[in-house]
Amino acid sequence: EEELQMIQPEKLLLVTVGKTATLHCTVTSLLPVGPVLWFRGVGPGRELIYNQKEGHFPRVTTVSDLTKRNNMDFSIRISSITPADVGTYYCVKFRKGSPENVEFKSGPGTEMALGAKPS
């Protein structure tokens, strides 16, 4: 069985205020079963950006249809970028656990930084 890898191809993503940013994340295996979440930052203070399981994230949309049973693309789009959105974003695979899911593997992260202002 192939070991799951979390692939975030861009180390740095330059974004423009007011525009939409696409953060890429693909997995190489669907196992173990469990959700993929997006965070900004690391450690106990990290900010949840998107949870495929539950929650309301009005500025976030998924690139792919996550309800496909064979989906391996967990990329997201964040709309209406502001300076407050800069930081490093991680897609993180959790394996199922009781009572809480357990963090299984994290992607290497994508740093989002502001590029040149639109002219």
Epitope: L31, K68, R69
Partner: antibody, heavy 118, light 107 residues
Framework: DVQLVESGGGVVRPGESLRLSCAAS????????MSWVRQAPGKGLEWLAG????????YYIDSVKGRFTISRDNSKNSLYLQMNSLTAEDTAVYYC???????????WGLGTLVTVSS | ALTQPASVSANPGETVKITCSGG??????YGWYQQKSPGSAPVTVI????KRPSDIPSRFSGSASGSAATLTITGVRVEDEAVYYC???????????FGAGTTLTVL
């Protein structure tokens, strides 16, 4: 409130076809995967097929693959099951069910009865 | 195939456990569905191993460990009499499977 209402059941002869519908309301239909489950008389529940929210991805149990087709029309908030080459073994109550994020079920319809008899 | 006992019985107020075995913990999520009479609409009592819908009483709980899942009814009531089906979603095959059902009789 989430509501799923199946229709289209009835009595057909072996070899004939039938199309079941499931009308959904009370939730954003286009955001959820859906499934069909059946129950033959005196038997247990049997999952038949599931379809992704966008409708491009479908899976079937082996016994209906090639005979049944699951589809959906998100503009009409409707799920369908096209059943061809029906046999007596397909006699059952057919339920539509909304899927959770991990392809289990949270809401069910009341079911529609399909009887295949000569 | 998922295996569950054909029947269990209990007195009101007792704790009932129904097991469902045959899935692979690494690749399977479990759910539990209550059907009060044949042909009536099933009701989801547990999904995602241990998640209880908001309208289901707290006496229903679920757990999963190894190759088995367990539905526990703590302080069973007469109205809990029903057939309980376990189901699994296998992330390896993308297929759902139901157990044969367990008839719960409250004496």
């Amino acid at each position: 409130d989430v509501q799923l209402v199946e229709s289209g059941g009835g009595v057909v002869r072996p070899g004939e076809s039938l199309r079941l519908s499931c009308a959904a309301s009370g939730f954003t239909f286009s955001s959820y995967a859906m499934s069909w489950v059946r129950q033959a008389p005196g038997k247990g529940l049997e999952w038949l097929a599931g379809i992704s929210a966008g409708g491009s991805d479908a899976y079937y149990i082996d016994s209906v693959k090639g005979r049944f087709t699951i589809s959906r029309d998100n503009s009409k908030n409707s799920l369908y099951l096209q059943m061809n080459s029906l046999t007596a073994e397909d006699t059952a109550v057919y339920y539509c069910a909304r899927e959770t994020w991990n392809h289990l079920f949270d809401y069910w319809g009341l079911g529609t009865l399909v009887t295949v008899s000569s | 195939a998922l295996t569950q006992p054909a029947s269990v019985s209990a007195n009101p107020g007792e704790t009932v456990k129904i097991t469902c075995s045959g899935g692979d913990w690494y690749s399977t999520y479990y759910g539990w569905y209550q059907q009060k009479s044949p042909g009536s609409a099933p009701v989801t009592v547990i999904h995602s191993d241990d998640k209880r819908p908001s309208d289901i009483p707290s006496r229903f709980s679920g757990s999963a460990s190894g190759s088995a899942a367990t539905l526990t009814i703590t302080g069973v009531r007469v109205e809990d009499e029903a057939v309980y089906y376990c189901a699994g979603y296998d992330g390896r095959t993308y297929i759902n499977t139901f157990g044969a059902g367990t008839t719960l009789t409250v004496l």
